[in-house]
Interface confidence: medium
């Protein structure tokens, strides 16, 4: 059974041409986190496995920078970047956590972030 | 030594399914992506898509979405590319090749390839 | 997509010519690109990665340079087991593309 929750930054907003910390953070199971996957809709951002450590998609190495931890951080931000971005977490025994975080980048120098919440 | 080794040459009416297999042998299996590239007849190279195998992440190709799929058996450590909906366009050699996991994108070996024919 | 297109697309030179091909892509692509030689019926094989870098075992008169949207693959002296197509590849976005080929023969 799973009984995890992963729990994001939510709804987050930031400038255009600035930076954004994308983070998820898996609690309330003992399952073994193997990798964990960033994706914009189908994309593949990047992935950190256990093992093998960060491997960051093409289309997006100069930009991305990996971490702080498992999360992952998004530079030279435009207006296309708004969207949905996924962190999925490959756990042991437990199976696939999903978090959704919603990135709006705006043309003004107003961004406030949104208020954290949990997807079971 | 590293090797790639494919299935056999396979002939398909217009509409079936395909499926390549490449077994990996002479390194670590999930420390490399499989990538699978194509070439017909006489023409040039078209990268169809990627699965990594300790996790089963996989990025396709748009132009191929639809159409395919990627698996893998790690116990055997063989990767499996299925091709859908055929048609005479798809008559091509397929490679598989891998990749390293990490910074620097290259695929230093191949398969020895497999032709598919699509023929009424 | 990233178009990359290759120049020429085939080329006849003499054993211990210098022999130049030129891939230009469609973007800019920051020097994400390799080159790989095909013989007829084989796989191709990869020879030089990340515009200049040569890989393990490949012999020295294969090299390569670049940057921005244009790239160059150079034999130094064409040797008669140089003749072969020699492909550009981007990797600087997904999908990674190819150039569409260069076909080198002895005169």
């Known amino acids: 059974m799973m009984t995890g929750t992963i729990e994001t930054t939510g709804n987050i907003s930031a400038e255009k041409g600035g930076s954004i910390i994308l983070q998820c953070h898996l609690s309330s199971t003992t399952a073994q986190v193997t990798q964990v996957n960033w994706e914009q809709q189908d994309q593949l951002l990047a992935i950190c496995n256990a093992d093998l450590g960060w491997h960051i998609s093409p289309s997006f190495k100069d930009r991305v920078a990996p971490g702080p931890g498992l999360g992952l951080t998004l530079q030279s931000l435009t207006v296309n970047d708004t969207g949905e971005y996924f962190c999925i977490y490959h756990t042991y025994p437990d199976g696939t956590y999903t978090g959704r975080i919603f990135l709006e980048v705006l043309e003004s120098s107003v961004a406030e972030h949104g208020a954290r919440f949990q997807i079971p | 030594q590293v090797q790639l080794v494919q299935s056999g040459a396979e002939v398909k009416k217009p509409g079936a399914s395909v499926k390549v297999s490449c077994k990996a042998t002479g390194y670590t299996f999930s420390n490399y992506w499989i990538e699978w590239v194509r070439q017909a007849p006489g023409q040039g190279l078209e990268w169809i898509g990627e699965?990594?195998?300790?996790?089963?992440?996989?990025y396709y190709n748009e132009n191929f979405k639809d159409r395919v799929t990627m698996t893998r058996d790690t116990s055997t450590s063989t990767v499996y590319m299925e091709l859908s909906s055929l048609r005479s366009e798809d008559t091509a050699v397929y490679y598989c090749?891998?990749?390293?996991?990490?910074?620097?994108?290259?695929?230093?070996?191949w398969g020895q390839g497999t032709l598919v024919t699509v023929s009424s | 997509a990233i178009q990359m297109t290759q120049s020429p697309s085939s080329l006849s030179a003499s054993v211990g010519d210098r022999v130049t091909i030129t891939c230009r892509a469609s973007?800019?692509?920051?020097?994400?690109l390799n080159w790989y030689q095909q013989k007829p019926g084989k796989a191709p094989k990869l020879l030089i990665y990340y515009t200049s870098s040569l890989h393990s075992g490949v012999p020295s008169r294969f090299s390569g340079s670049g940057s921005g949207t244009d790239y160059t693959f150079t034999i130094s002296s064409l040797q008669p087991e140089d003749i072969a197509t020699y492909y550009c590849?981007?990797?600087?976005?997904?999908?990674?593309?190819f150039g569409q080929g260069t076909k080198v023969e002895i005169k």
């Open positions: 590849h981007q990797y600087s976005k997904l999908p990674y593309t």
């Open positions: 699965i990594l195998p300790g996790s089963g992440s996989s």
């Open positions: 090749a891998r990749q390293k996991y990490g910074n620097f994108y290259y695929f230093d070996f």
């Open positions: 973007q800019g692509i920051g020097n994400y």
